[in-house]
């Protein structure tokens, strides 16, 4: 009998997907409802536990006991600002158990609390069962994907969820990397290609730049936003219709959880419709206090409601290009991943940003990640299929890793965006005469001083024979495995004595937001990035001014105060500028400022005529934060030149 296949699971924030590589190709497996993606939802009722479609379908009836977004909690502490922020938006209760978040629900008449790992394990169990029903035999081996910026804690917790689900987790891989594998299999041409993967899903957004060369994948840079996706677009629609309901019926439904949940379901359906139609209808019977809510929305209005969110997707694209040290003209292929990339405006913004370059939509955006995970699972199980045998995967470390040397200096051994797995060794020495030991303090971050970076862990190497400063040779090795787990070893070369530390989930690694903040702070102190900050500032000023002017002249209160000719003049110029902005997000500061001044030249004389005595409206200012203070501890180890 042929050996059991390993599966690839895309464990998504809102939806999950499972695939298997067999007979030389990937099969994405449909669930018992015939759907190729399954909601990452778990519901608890008085009689049963529901997972997937069944859980999501009853969410309006049972919101407090229907858990979703476990991925936003997994591997995080309760006090994490992300957790605290997200909690405000969830209908289910999150409690604090020793600074670990737990979801509290009512199940079979009892109050139960589950760790995020347990909730995720239930979703993984469902995905495992879907695969088993298709394959006809038990499945144990799996590759599971996570967002590119998940830290060790989050990766380890995801692995734990797999174990709880009865899976042998072969590897945790990045979602964009998995998508690249899927894409790579479609490529037969030779020569190096730079590929940008734009992954906009239900809850997270990742941009990755990879080079693919004859089956070898290398991640050059990653960027993104763990809190941007389809749900955010749904929220904009929900808010829009809550306001519409207020206007039409003079009633506020926002505090009625069931009504809002039903509205959200209808909004999600409408959003999907708007990807293929220019208008969508909503028909919700007895939405609130017996009132039927029948309405519609155009694609244009939806695009306006989400315009800032859509445009914000280009910022990580710019960042990834900078990190990869590539110009947009050097990108050969653009790959769309995630259901939200079906939105025409999102596609247009990306296409315009890349000067009309065709987007690669050949891969079903909902399935690409699971597809790649399934391929990787086959590789790790030793599949000798011609399609996969030469495939090599190189991932990256999202932040520089190093240790503290004399004077609190951050000495990086592994640079940010280094491909992993990787191993780097450097020789250090003592700072004082007859120093008996060294304290190895491991940090991640981009700042020059360790006090501004994140301490991952520390350990001591003692028993160094007495010697003048600078004589002992301490060999320090940083080793990151394929799952991004870091091992740091220090060895005294004269005695062979060694000590080590493994940085894992209990060491409080950083969230994606913190990673981005640290990277931004580090860049802020580099002269060349001052230019970038000014550029973004000029862009934001132009964008704000254009939208403010557009809103100002469209204000119903101005009817009769502004001539149609003047209104048209302003709107035409705003349209010109907004369209130009959409197509030129990487323009120079001078260009943004020029456009703003051009727009002001048109608008200010007209607007000032409306608001006699007041100055013409202009863009807001942008504050800058100085470096934070703090004192470092005394030197313990010195770098050898």
């Amino acid at each position: 009998m042929a050996k059991a296949a390993a599966i690839g699971i895309d464990l998504g924030t809102t939806y999950s997907c499972v695939g298997v590589f067999q007979h030389g190709k990937v099969e994405i497996i449909a669930n018992d409802q015939g759907n190729r993606t399954t909601p990452s939802y778990v519901a608890f009722t008085d009689t049963e536990r529901l997972i997937g479609d069944a859980a999501k379908n009853q969410v309006a009836l049972n919101p407090q006991n229907t858990v979703f977004d476990a991925k936003r909690l997994i591997g995080r502490k309760f006090g994490d600002p992300v957790v605290q922020s997200d909690m405000k938006h969830w209908p289910f209760q999150v409690i604090n158990d020793g600074d670990k978040p737990k979801v509290q629900v009512s199940y079979k008449g009892e109050t139960k609390a589950f760790y995020p790992e347990e909730i995720s394990s239930m979703v993984l169990t469902k995905m495992k069962e879907i695969a088993e029903a298709y394959l006809g035999y038990p499945v144990t081996n799996a590759v599971i994907t996570v967002p590119a910026y998940f830290n060790d804690s989050q990766r380890q917790a995801t692995k734990d969820a797999g174990v709880i689900a009865g899976l042998n987790v072969l590897r945790i891989i990045n979602e964009p990397t998995a998508a690249a594998i899927a894409y790579g299999l479609d490529r037969t041409g030779k020569g190096e290609r730079n590929v940008l993967i734009f992954d906009l899903g239900g809850g997270t957004f990742d941009v990755s730049i990879l080079t693919i060369d004859d089956g070898i994948f290398e991640v050059k840079a990653t960027a993104g936003d763990t809190h941007l996706g389809g749900e955010d677009f749904d929220n904009r629609l929900v808010n829009h219709f809550v306001e519409e309901f207020k206007r039409k019926h003079k009633k506020d439904i926002s505090q009625n959880k069931r009504a809002v949940r039903r509205l959200r379901t209808a909004c999600e359906r409408a959003k999907r419709t708007l990807s293929s139609s220019t208008q969508a209808s909503l028909e919700i019977d007895s939405l609130f206090e017996g009132i039927d809510f029948y309405t519609s929305i155009t694609r244009a209005r939806f695009e306006e409601l989400c315009s800032d969110l859509f445009r914000s997707t280009l910022e990580p694209v710019e960042k990834a290009l900078r990190d990869a040290k590539l110009d947009k003209a050097q990108i050969h292929d653009l790959v769309l991943v995630g259901g939200s990339t079906r939105i025409p405006k999102v596609q247009k913004l990306l296409q315009d940003f890349f000067n009309g370059r065709d987007l690669n939509k050949s891969i079903n955006p909902d399935e690409a990640v699971a597809y790649g995970a399934a391929v990787q699972a086959a590789i790790l199980m030793g599949d000798k299929s011609e399609n996969v045998q030469d495939l090599l995967l190189l991932d990256v470390a999202p932040l520089s890793l190093g240790l503290e040397t004399a004077g609190g200096v951050m000495t990086a051994l592994i640079k940010r965006n280094s491909t992993i797995p990787t191993k780097q060794t450097q020789i250090f020495t003592t700072y004082s005469d007859n120093q008996p030991g060294v304290l190895i303090q491991v940090y991640e971050g981009e700042r020059a001083m360790t006090k501004d970076n994140n301490l991952l862990g520390r350990f001591e190497l003692s028993g160094i024979p007495p010697a003048p400063r600078g004589v002992p040779q301490i060999e320090v090795t940083f080793d990151i495995d394929a799952n991004g787990i870091l091992n740091v070893t220090a060895t005294d070369k004269s005695t062979g004595k060694a000590n080590k530390i493994t940085i894992t989930n209990d060491k409080g690694r950083l969230s994606k937001e913190e990673i981005e903040r640290m990277v931004q702070e580090a860049e802020k102190y580099k002269a060349e990035d001052e230019v970038q900050r000014e550029r973004v500032s000029a862009k934001n000023a132009l964008e704000s001014y254009a939208f403010n002017m557009k809103s100002a002249v469209e204000d119903e209160g101005l009817k009769g105060k502004i001539s149609e000719a003047d209104k048209k003049k302003v709107l035409d110029k705003c349209q010109e500028v907004i369209s130009w902005l959409d197509a030129n997000t990487l323009a120079e500061k001078d260009e943004f400022e020029h456009k703003r001044k051009e727009l002001e030249q048109v608008c200010n004389p007209i607007i000032s005529g409306l608001y006699q005595g007041a100055g013409g409206p202009g863009p807001g200012g942008f504050g800058a934060q100085g470096p934070k203070g703090g004192s470092g501890s005394g030197p313990t180890i010195e770098e050898v030149d």
Epitope: D352, D572, Q575, E576, S579, W580, E591, K597, Q601, G616
Partner: antibody, heavy 116, light 112 residues
Framework: QIQLVQSGAEVKKPGASVKVSCKAS????????MNWVRQAPGQGLEWMGW????????TYADDFKGRFTFTTDTSTSTAYMDLRSLRSDDTAVYFC?????????WGQGTLVTVSS | EIVLTQSPDSLSVSLGERATINCKSS????????????LAWYQQKAGQSPNLLIY???TRESGVPDRFSGSGSGTDFTLSIDSLQAEDVAVYYC????????FGGGTKVEIK
């Protein structure tokens, strides 16, 4: 009718400064931007930059940053172009031009000659 | 910076014949929102100031004879003078205003 009248020709020594004026009439000065264009002898047109006449904010083309300054006096509907540390290659005719959808009205030009 | 390349540098055309001047941009001048190409054409007669002929690729400035027409989109543009008159002898410049402004190098039109 709309007119842009520029100041007369100037002959200057290298290192000196010059200020060219451009007086607008026949329209509301602060409603339209004022551009400056240079044309060296026998050469083509070079866009130097422009000034937002409402806010007074100038924009300079890359080759014209540093020694050039654009200003306005809205009380007299006049735009000015200042050039300091004159060099021989600054010898040219300098035009001002009003901007609507394009440069629709031009001054007659001011010849600045830099010679030792 | 957008570079505009005009061709030919000079052109000799018989009276009454058609003159065609080309202008190629280093990047697209099309704004997809307004569906306009931000390219203008200017005429400069000897010893005079330039004069606006056409903006937004094909919109004639008021008072400009209809023998002058502009066409093109994206990166390739053309100014046509349908039936060349003696008073059309001049240097013609294209100019982009898609982002900042730049002029082309000019094309001298003479009578053959």
């Amino acid at each position: 009718q709309i007119q842009l009248v520029q100041s007369g020709a100037e002959v200057k020594k290298p290192g000196a400064s010059v200020k060219v004026s451009c007086k607008a009439s026949g329209y509301t000065f602060t409603n339209y931007g004022m551009n400056w264009v240079r044309q060296a002898p026998g050469q083509g047109l070079e866009w130097m930059g422009w000034i937002n006449t409402y806010t007074g904010e100038p924009t300079y083309a890359d080759d014209f940053k540093g020694r050039f300054t654009f200003t306005t006096d809205t009380s007299t509907s006049t735009a000015y172009m200042d050039l300091r540390s004159l060099r021989s290659d600054d010898t040219a005719v300098y035009f001002c031009a009003r901007y609507d959808h394009a440069m629709d009205y031009w001054g007659q030009g001011t010849l600045v000659t830099v010679s030792s | 910076e957008i570079v505009l390349t005009q061709s030919p540098d000079s052109l000799s055309v018989s009276l009454g014949e058609r003159a065609t001047i080309n202008c190629k941009s280093s990047q697209s001048l099309l704004n997809s929102g307004t569906r306009k190409n931000y390219l203008a054409w200017y005429q400069q007669k000897a010893g005079q100031s330039p004069n606006l002929l056409i903006y937004w690729t094909s919109t004639r400035e008021s008072g400009v004879p209809d023998r002058f027409s502009g066409s093109g989109s994206g990166t390739d543009f053309t100014l046509s003078i349908d039936s060349l008159q003696a008073e059309d002898v001049a240097v013609y410049y294209c100019k982009q205003s898609y982002t900042l402004y730049t002029f082309g190098g000019g094309t001298k039109v003479e009578i053959k």
